[in-house]
């Protein structure tokens, strides 16, 4: 997260760290007791590595009573996700067992009504991604509030030049932005999950390259079918 601040500890009990061989790889969001939603591209280079999900965490390194690492029983990328596109960049991870819920671990309601969030709406994005252009990784969860950007502006040639489909949304990126390592994390508007940080190699913090988020409402049928 660029231009953000340290989050209040455990105030986002839905927040997950998707880990590869014990190290933070991507963000994720608990959407059901046994399911975490993240980004499909996160596992592209995972190969034979061990993928796990950390829940109930604020610090990645310090011991915390609520922290627990779960193995992954099943990883389900969206069937239409492809390595070279930002489209359909969703991944559902089934935990090896139901998460132990509590004040620091709780699923987040997700948007099912397929309607765009109004431009200018302030939404919260959180993650353990890099916090500066030098690539410094934080130990504790960071967050930032970002205004939603209208799709027409996001589709301008100097922005994302027509790449933003109806199944994607954008948020402003003027110094405050999601960045590498935040992919798969939640964009939360009015206490509801609206978007998932896409995992392209986008430049961060440049206002002409807005953050791109996959709209979960557009994938409600797929999410329901996997969770069923």
């Amino acid at each position: 997260i660029l231009g953000g601040r340290e989050a209040e500890a455990h105030a986002r009990p839905y927040m997950a760290s998707v880990q590869l061989n014990g190290a933070h790889l991507c963000g994720g969001v608990l959407v059901a007791e046994q399911w975490v939603l993240s980004a499909a591209h996160c596992l592209e280079d995972a190969a034979d590595g061990k993928v796990q999900v950390l829940l109930g965490a604020h610090s990645l390194s310090q011991p915390e009573p609520s922290k627990r690492l779960y193995d992954v029983l099943r990883a389900v990328p969206h069937p239409d996700s492809q390595p070279d596109t930002i489209d359909h960049d969703l991944l559902l991870l089934q935990l090896s067992e139901k998460a132990t819920l509590g004040p620091a671990v709780r699923p987040l309601p997700w948007q099912r009504v397929d309607r765009d969030v109004a431009p200018g709406t302030l939404c919260d994005v959180a993650g353990w991604g890099i916090v500066n252009h030098a690539g410094r990784r934080p130990d504790s969860l960071q967050h930032v509030l970002l205004p939603v950007l209208d799709r027409a502006t996001c589709n301008r040639r100097t922005h994302h030049d027509g790449a933003i489909t109806e199944r994607l949304m954008c948020a402003e990126s003027n110094r405050r932005d999601s960045c590498k390592g935040d992919s798969g994390g939640p964009l939360v508007c009015g206490g509801v999950l609206e978007g998932v940080v896409t995992s392209g190699s986008r430049v961060c913090g440049n206002r002409k390259k807005p953050g791109i988020y996959t709209r979960v409402a557009s994938y409600a049928a797929w999410i329901d079918s996997v969770l069923a």
């Epitope: 799709r151 027409a152 589709n155 040639r157 100097t158 030049d161 027509g162 933003i164 109806e166």
Partner: antibody, heavy 116, light 112 residues
Framework: EVQLVESGGGLVQPGGSLRLSCAAS????????MNWVRQAPGKGLEWIGD????????DYNADFKRRFTFSLDTSKSTAYLQMNSLRAEDTAVYYC?????????WGQGTLVTVSS | DIQLTQSPSSLSASVGDRVTITCRSS???????????LEWYQQKPGKAPNLLIY???NRWSGVPSRFSGSGSGTDFTLTISSLQPEDFATYYC?????????FGQGTKVEIK
């Protein structure tokens, strides 16, 4: 299939007004800026300006700012170009073109002739 | 405003010829996001322009590989490696990096 269809061109006297329409189909109208470009007979392409179909924000080439105005009817997926105080040198084919990707999609153009 | 100057203004060539059109801008067209929004359009009489190349060197969908773009800063080139009958048209460069966006004056490619 993305389609842009202009209409409203024709013969108008110097000093007169005309409103051109650009009807869009095959995509969500509010997801892309609309630009207007004109081409005088035997001449090159000249950018008039653009409009954001969500906010209505406009940007005009300084040469057109005083006499030309963009508007929208999102319920009809249509953009409009209102041209006032027309002069002989405004005689041209007027195009609308969607921005994103680049100017990949254009209308067929509509001819405006300013003559007495 | 940024001026784009194309050369030549017109040229005569034969089918199979290699054709090069240049476009020079009055100032750099590198955008603040580090991309260069230099595009090339082809226009045939009575028709709307067609996008050929975007961001200096990227071919638009369906554009034949004989069309290529290159350049940086202020100097750009459109090359047609082997001219085909359907390529006789007018070609325009365009910069979208700075408002007002601008077109070159055009290069007419005619049959020799």
């Amino acid at each position: 299939e993305v389609q842009l269809v202009e209409s409203g061109g024709g013969l108008v006297q110097p000093g007169g007004s005309l409103r051109l329409s650009c009807a869009a189909s095959g995509y969500t109208f509010t997801d892309y800026y609309m630009n207007w470009v004109r081409q005088a007979p035997g001449k090159g392409l000249e950018w008039i300006g653009d409009i954001n179909p969500v906010t209505g924000d406009t940007d005009y080439n300084a040469d057109f700012k005083r006499r030309f105005t963009f508007s929208l009817d999102t319920s009809k997926s249509t953009a409009y170009l209102q041209m006032n105080s027309l002069r002989a040198e405004d005689t041209a084919v007027y195009y609308c073109t969607r921005e994103g990707p680049s100017f990949a999609y254009w209308g067929q153009g509509t001819l405006v002739t300013v003559s007495s | 405003d940024i001026q784009l100057t194309q050369s030549p203004s017109s040229l005569s060539a034969s089918v199979g010829d290699r054709v090069t059109i240049t476009c020079r801008s009055s100032q750099t067209i590198v955008h603040s996001n580090d991309d260069t929004y230099l595009e090339w359009y082809q226009q045939k009489p009575g028709k709307a322009p067609n996008l050929l190349i975007y961001k200096v060197s990227n071919r638009w969908s369906g554009v034949p590989s004989r069309f290529s773009g290159s350049g940086s800063g202020t100097d750009f080139t459109l090359t047609i490696s082997s001219l085909q009958p359907e390529d006789f048209a007018t070609y325009y460069c365009f910069q979208g990096s700075h408002v007002p966006v601008t077109f070159g004056q055009g290069t007419k490619v005619e049959i020799k």
